[in-house]
């Protein structure tokens, strides 16, 4: 049986031109983690594997960059960034878990305006 | 290229340990688990368990928790098998195998339990 | 612990003659995984995750099925084909099936 689970950003928002992290944590398993595969939508962003390390898709090698730790920093955000991502934890032996990040990109005022509206 | 190579056959009596050793190559031995796999003469696989090469943490399957530990040396590379109080049942091909679907299996440690 | 059933335990077939060998769970499983093992060595990978064909593995094995039913299928069976043949899933506590044993007439 599965026990793990996996904490999540979960819906974030940020300023167009600026930058985020991606975060997704695996917990409650002593599954050992042998690869995070980090996709938006059906597209591969990158993949970190514990042995070889970390591999960033061509297409995205300019405004992707790894970490901190598992996640992933993606620079130069675009309106077109706003959608699902998505990190895949290969485990044995639980097998794969997935997390569920949602992104949306704002216009530079928009997203300041929102800011000052956040709940802690 | 990545290898798992086993001990080699133990002839042992009932009631005496054994240990069998995998050792580990072409890969960073910390970054995938390792299970045991029992295949006794004549029949199926059966999983014993595996150890987190990373944590050091044992897990085993509900038949074979008591006798049988899982051990590590990382700075060889090498996962251990440990069988204490040796049975007539125990006879049998113990596999260890690395915990990814990438399929890389040991040759196979072949343990003989006989009076 | 989910129990997984193969049939048939024993399947006789022709050479190149298509056949299907079956594994089905007790409880749903996420991914299937087929070993070939012949007299003597250790099992080998022929397909992982269900449907992706393992490195060196001829194309006439393919793998497919969801849920609780999985299948591995030779197209066209050969000579060498003959051994026994595992499934093996993970989903927490790993367990094989019972072994198909595949004999060549």
């Known amino acids: 049986m599965m026990t793990g689970t996996i904490e999540t950003t979960g819906n974030i928002s940020a300023e167009k031109g600026g930058s985020i992290i991606l975060q997704c944590h695996l917990s409650s398993t002593t599954a050992q983690v042998t690869q995070v595969n980090w996709e938006q939508q059906d597209q591969l962003l990158a993949i970190c594997n514990a042995d070889l390390g970390w591999h960033i898709s061509p297409s995205f090698k300019d405004r992707v960059a790894p970490g901190p730790g598992l996640g992933l920093t993606l620079q130069s955000l675009t309106v077109n960034d706003t959608g699902e991502y998505f990190c895949i934890y290969h485990t044995y032996p639980d097998g794969t878990y997935t997390g569920r990040i949602f992104l949306e990109v704002l216009e530079s005022s928009v997203a300041e305006h929102g800011a000052r509206f956040q709940i802690p | 290229q990545i290898q798992l190579v086993q001990s080699g056959p133990e002839l042992k009596k009932p009631g005496e340990t054994v240990k069998i050793s995998c050792k580990a190559s072409g890969y960073t031995f910390t970054a995938y688990g390792m299970s045991w796999v029992k295949q006794t003469p004549g029949k199926g696989l059966k999983w014993m368990g595996w150890i987190n090469t990373y944590s050091g943490v044992p897990t085993y399957a509900d038949d074979f928790k008591g006798r049988f530990a899982f051990s590590l040396e990382t700075s060889a590379s090498t996962a251990y098998l440990q069988i204490n109080n040796l049975k007539n049942e125990d006879t049998a091909t113990y596999f260890c195998t690395r915990g990814d679907t990438g399929g890389y299996w040991g040759q196979g440690a072949t343990l003989t339990v006989s009076s | 612990q989910i129990v997984l059933t193969q049939s048939p335990a024993i399947m006789s077939a022709s050479l190149g003659e298509e056949i299907t060998l079956t594994c089905s769970a007790r409880?749903?499983?996420?991914?299937m995984h087929w070993y070939q093992q012949k007299s003597g060595t250790s099992p080998k990978l022929l397909i992982y995750?269900?449907?992706n064909l393992a490195s060196g593995v001829p194309s006439r094995f393919s793998g497919s099925g969801s849920g609780t039913f999985f299948s591995l299928t030779i197209s066209s069976v050969e000579a060498e084909d003959a051994a026994d043949y595992y499934c093996?899933?993970?989903?927490?506590?790993?367990?094989f099936g019972g072994g198909t044993k595949l004999e060549i007439k």
């Open positions: 093996h899933q993970w989903g927490g506590y790993p367990t």
């Open positions: 409880s749903s499983v996420s991914d």
């Open positions: 995750s269900t449907s």
